[in-house]
Interface confidence: medium
């Protein structure tokens, strides 16, 4: 009797695990074995697929085969007893495109009101994801063990901290990876549970803010208790998007180590231009608080949200105001990649009645003024970006007299 070729071959690839499954064509024939060959693109000859020769079951693993995962591969299978079936050819495929992302590894650390999540790809030194290991983003589902009400958090990176949790409470979570460059969504990790610790005696500092004074940055925060010391650390924010572990190290700000006030002042040249994360910790000598929530600190926005510089051209019934970029030390205008909106306040010198104009443009007309009258003007800049809500302080007031009548042109 002629052996029939096996049918319905499925290729399952999860991380670096290559599994083949197929259906027997004839269940009535016993002691049948199955063998696979493979062929790479541009090759004419077929090669025996190691790990998938003379298989008695309907599943085999060819993970040991060293393949270029970005190259197309073709497979064929046949049944063997005394004689052999004809070959059944499987549609060609590219392993990388077919691969699914396996469950990530998850390690949890508990604080009193926060959980730190360390996530790494499930397969260490994966061949499949060798070019993508640092491009993974993750999403998670977290719930209180007692309630089961789920909260989803999308687009997190390999280190993530969830704040505003309850002390001494068990939280459970599961995590899956995604590779957005390839539009791949992985499978969830097993569920991990952890209990938050007893409430710490010292809460973390809150409401951290950065401002610029002269050539210094001033970092301020709120704290519940007096007679404390504080330390501040920074991290380059670039590491959040692609966190290479060897560089993911928080560093001290030298002028903000063991400060006894709820603020510290450090020179602007401590930081190169860039975006950083800052965090603050409190200590009373015996105990330390957990770290505060991280704040984002952007040197460029701090620098250029100095008050705007402007010139006034006076007419009889209006002012034309020309806004320029503020100057940094060295008198060079700040590079302005952020969109700004300008708030202009003006008033008659003899009156307290202020009028306001909000304008995107850098040339603004202040209308309906009286001739030969002194008006004062001050301005400030705001970012228009939804992700950064910052405002400069007002510029110093500049006072000008309008021209005599009929010079409005």
């Amino acid at each position: 009797k002629n052996l029939k070729s096996p049918q319905k071959v499925e290729v399952d690839i999860i991380d670096d695990n290559f599994i083949l499954r197929w259906n027997r064509s004839d269940e009535s024939v016993g002691n049948v074995t199955f063998s696979f060959d493979y062929q790479k693109t541009g090759m004419d000859n077929w090669i025996k697929l190691s790990g998938c020769q003379n298989i008695t079951s309907t599943k085999c693993n060819f993970s040991s085969l060293k393949l270029n995962v970005y190259e197309e591969i073709k497979l064929r299978i046949r049944a063997e007893k005394e004689n052999t079936s004809s070959w059944y050819e499987v549609d060609s495929f590219t392993p990388f495109r077919k691969a699914q992302i396996g469950p990530p590894e998850v390690h949890l650390e508990a604080e009193d009101k926060a959980i730190v999540i360390h996530i790494s790809p499930g397969t260490k030194d994966s061949v499949m994801w060798a070019l993508d290991g640092l491009s993974f983003t993750y999403s998670l589902v977290i719930w209180k063990n007692s309630s089961g009400v789920e909260e989803r958090i999308e687009n997190i990176y390999s280190r993530h901290k969830i704040y505003k949790l309850s002390p001494e409470t068990t939280y459970c979570l599961k995590v899956k990876a995604a590779l957005l460059t390839s539009w791949k969504i992985g499978v969830y990790s097993p569920v991990h549970c952890i209990k938050t610790t007893v409430e710490n005696e010292l809460p973390p500092p809150e409401n951290i803010e950065v401002s610029v004074q002269n050539q210094n940055y001033v970092l301020k925060w709120d704290y519940t208790y007096a007679n404390m010391t504080f330390q501040v650390q920074w991290l380059h924010a670039f590491l959040k998007r692609n966190p290479g572990n060897h560089l993911y190290k928080w560093k001290q700000i030298p002028d903000c180590e063991n400060v006894k006030t709820t603020q510290c002042v450090f020179p602007q040249n401590v930081f190169q231009k860039g975006i950083y994360l800052l965090r603050v910790q409190a200590s009373d000598g015996n105990n330390t608080s957990f770290w505060s929530e991280e704040i984002k600190f952007d040197t460029e926005i701090q620098a250029f949200l100095l008050p705007p510089v402007f010139n006034i051209r006076s007419l009889s019934d209006s002012f034309h105001i020309y806004i320029g970029a503020p100057k940094q030390s060295g008198n060079t205008p700040v590079i302005q990649d952020y969109p700004l909106i300008y708030e202009i306040i003006f008033w008659e010198n003899t009156s307290n009645a202020e009028r306001k104009i909000i304008e995107k443009k850098t040339d603004v007309t202040v209308p309906n003024l009286k001739p030969l009258t002194v008006y004062c003007v001050k301005a400030r800049a705001h970012t228009m970006d939804e992700k950064l809500n910052k405002s400069s302080v007002f510029s110093d007031a500049v006072c000008e007299k309008t021209k005599p009548g009929n010079t409005s042109k």
Epitope: L131, L134, N155, Y157, L180, T181, H236, A237, F238, L239, K240, R241, N242, P243, G244, L247, Q272, K273, G274, I275, L277, K296, D298, E300, I301, I335, D337, Y338, P339, D385, E386, K387, L388
Partner: antibody
């Protein structure tokens, strides 16, 4: 002012390797990612991937995995694109571009572009 | 992948006219869309980012609008120097570009 200056045009044979440079000036090199784009003759722009100039980690778009490699010479504020085992279909102009102000974890528009490097692959 | 579709391959217009270039995203990209102008033999130049913010030095005849999946670049009072190809790009998740729309001046 901010500039990205790319190396000159290249004429290569199939199977050879090409390495294009992109020299940045006017800003702190390690604060902004460098992205690479391909534009085949008469075609649109295709994003090839980016390199994190702070960590040196590259990210490749699907169609550019395998033969393509991004690298850095941070001390010279220069990013490189290397293409191995060149094929005829690699004939294109390659652009490097710097992101605008980025927000960590997010992506930003491409604010500054190199002038482009034409790579011609022909037997 | 997020696909950006510019259905108009060419638009023919006259100096002084108002013209709209459209771009459709295959899924919601919020306002993370930029527009670039590319003249023959040159690199692309940023015109608009975050859907509607004009980039530094870009004339105010260029405006951007839209959100979610539908985006428009409008050029009012078209000038002869606007003859170029215009590309949209999403940066909500990595980067993808539209196929481009060539503006021809009659």
């Amino acid at each position: 002012q901010i500039q990205l200056v790319q190396s000159g045009p290249e004429l290569k044979k199939p199977g050879e390797t090409v390495k294009i440079s992109c020299k940045a000036s006017g800003y702190t090199f390690t604060n902004y990612g460098v992205n690479w784009m391909k534009q085949a003759p008469g075609k649109g722009l295709k994003w090839m991937g980016w390199i994190n100039t702070y960590t040196g980690e590259p990210t490749y778009a699907d169609d550019f995995k395998g033969r393509f490699a991004f690298s850095l010479e941070t001390s010279a504020s220069t990013a490189y694109l290397q293409i191995n085992n060149l094929k005829n279909e690699d004939t294109a102009t390659y652009f490097c571009a710097r992101e605008g102000v980025y927000y960590y974890g997010d992506w930003a528009w491409l604010a500054y572009w190199g002038q482009g490097t034409l790579v011609t692959v022909s037997a | 992948d997020i696909v950006m579709t510019q259905s108009q391959k060419f638009i023919s217009t006259s100096v002084g006219d108002r013209v709209s270039v459209t771009c459709k995203a295959s899924q919601n990209v919020g306002t993370n869309v930029a527009w670039y102008q590319q003249k023959p033999g040159q690199s692309p130049k940023t015109l608009i980012y975050s859907t509607s913010y004009r980039y530094n030095g870009v004339p105010d005849r260029f405006t951007g609008s839209g959100s979610g999946t539908d985006f428009t670049l409008t050029i009012s009072n078209v000038q002869s120097e606007d003859l170029a190809e215009y590309f949209c790009q999403q940066y909500n998740s990595y980067y993808t570009f539209g196929g481009g729309t060539k503006l021809e001046i009659k």
